[in-house]
Interface confidence: medium
């Protein structure tokens, strides 16, 4: 099934995905008994329900959420099948054969969070996380339909030449892993805190001093590959002084559509 379940919006008895699901939640929805997509569905549910016994996606579903949306329906095209509405986003159902994806979003007005739907999926038993860095957007409390905006994804790779890769970077539970992940996440919030940056995901560490790979998300049209790389390179000096990270061999590329992410070991907030 690919039809998105519609929920209405406000507070939340149970607003998160079922265990094993890779769908992170949206918040603040009102009413709907049980509108989960069928198992295997990629339909985006909205979450955060007041009178809803269970609006979680079924186990194994990769459905991301809808937040704070005012009403829109149609098809979208762009560098990925994620659409941003009123500063929020809803992911369209993914159709690998096409860049134009149908979507349908429930109409409601709410003061609940604006967030970007995650693409993260799990890689292994220790990394079943739908990680979380906030978008820089804020709610648009208009109740009229708004133009949908696409999301552009960029794959970024760089070396930290003053660190040595060791087994701790293969284990998300180690302090070393978590502190490096935390510093890198914070660093990107500082680098791209001006306009358009929606978040990052899928941090991975690889051997070779330490090779860091991750995916960045921006509102479509706000930045290109060259600017992503330029802004990152301009931060190298501060990265060295502030985080003691000596960065080299920076590489940025567009993420081809459709975006299929293998999650690193981030966790939600």
């Amino acid at each position: 099934s690919t039809a998105p379940p519609a929920h209405g919006v406000t507070s939340a008895p149970d607003t998160r995905p079922a265990p094993g699901s890779t769908a992170p939640p949206a918040h603040g929805v009102t009413s709907a008994p049980d509108t989960r997509p069928a198992p295997g569905s990629t339909a985006p549910p909205a979450h955060g329900v007041t009178s809803a016994p269970d609006n979680r996606p079924a186990l194994g579903s990769t459905a991301p959420p809808v937040h704070n949306v005012t009403s829109a329906s149609g098809s979208a095209s762009g560098s990925a099948s994620t659409l941003v509405h009123n500063g929020t986003s809803a992911r369209a159902t993914t159709t690998p054969a096409s860049k134009s994806t149908p979507f349908s979003i429930p109409s409601h007005h709410s003061d609940t969070p604006t967030t970007l739907a995650s693409h993260s999926t799990k890689t292994d038993a220790s990394s079943t996380h739908h990680s979380s860095v906030p978008p820089l957007t804020s709610s648009n409390h208009s109740t009229s339909p708004q133009l949908s905006t696409g999301v552009s994804f960029f794959f970024l790779s760089f070396h930290i030449s003053n660190l040595q890769f060791n087994s701790s970077l293969e284990d998300p539970s180690t302090d070393y892993y978590q502190e490096l992940q935390r510093d890198i996440s914070e660093m990107f919030l500082q680098i791209y805190k001006q306009g358009g940056f929606l978040g990052l995901s899928n941090i991975k560490f690889r051997p070779g001093s330490v090779v860091v790979q991750l995916t960045l998300a921006f509102r479509e049209g706000t930045i290109n590959v060259h600017d992503v790389e330029t802004q990152f390179n301009q931060y190298k000096t501060e990265a060295a002084s502030r985080y003691n990270l000596t960065i080299s061999d920076v590489s940025v590329s567009d993420v081809p559509f459709p975006f299929s992410a293998q999650s690193g070991a981030g966790v939600p907030g």
Epitope: P19, P25, H129, H130, G266
Partner: antibody
């Protein structure tokens, strides 16, 4: 309804230990990062620790690092704070809180805010 | 760590008046700032997240604004139940930090 019910406070001597518990109900506990925040008498709020939904990632304030351990038992819908080597300055009301989740990205401490709080439990460290 | 300074420390107003609370960060926190309300003997309550977004169930008289280093919480018309202590909190940089609080008391 969504609620967090705390227990485990008390009066202990410096150097001793206390374990705080926070029982969650009304939501899928295993899907939320959880925090501990404390408030010394007559003072403001101080963030203490956070744990990811699956219990893997944990972060601590420098003031408690190495002495406090945050943990969770998702099968029991319960969050814990084990406090060892307690000092007088650890005396406070301790609150557990649920993180209003964000969606895209990494690292659990980037959250929108703490949207559900326990009622608080008092830990007093005194000789 | 980022230091959040709230002002004034105490605000004495009457019901129906407008309250304006300030929170200043020692360095930019972009829009990553939340506001909480705390009444005596109670846990804090999330009012505003990310500078300007009202949390679920928060009345429209509460509004937040600002970005970078200067933020404002405005209560357009004080209700009797609004007299409390208000805290700001940033999540831009590690560790998360709170302001020292502003007490809104009845004049």
């Amino acid at each position: 309804q969504v609620q967090l019910v705390q227990s485990g406070g008390g009066v202990v001597q410096p150097g001793r230990s206390l374990r705080l518990s926070c029982a969650a109900s009304g939501f899928t506990f295993s899907s939320y990062a959880m925090h501990w925040v404390r408030q010394a008498p007559g003072k403001g709020l101080e963030w203490v620790a956070v744990i990811s939904d699956d219990g893997i990632n944990k972060y601590y304030a420098d003031s408690v690092k190495g002495r406090f351990t945050i943990s969770r038992d998702n099968s029991k819908n319960t969050l814990y704070l084990q406090m060892n080597s307690l000092r007088a300055e650890d005396s406070a009301v301790y609150y557990c809180a649920r993180a209003l989740p964000t969606i895209f990205g990494v690292v659990m401490y980037f959250y929108y805010g703490l949207d559900v709080w326990g009622q608080g439990t008092t830990a007093t460290v005194s000789s | 760590e980022i230091v959040l300074t709230q002002s004034p420390a105490t605000l004495s107003l009457s019901p129906g008046e407008r309250a304006t609370l300030s929170c200043r960060a020692s360095q930019s926190v972009s829009s990553y700032l939340a506001w909480y309300q705390q009444k005596p003997g109670q846990a804090p309550r999330l009012l505003i997240y990310d500078a300007s977004n009202r949390a679920t169930g928060i009345p429209a008289r509460f509004s937040g604004s600002g970005s970078g280093t200067d933020f404002t919480l405005t209560i357009s018309s004080l209700e009797p139940e609004d007299f409390a202590v208000y805290y700001c909190q940033q999540r831009s940089n590690w560790p998360p930090t709170f302001g020292q609080g502003t007490k809104v008391e009845i004049k």
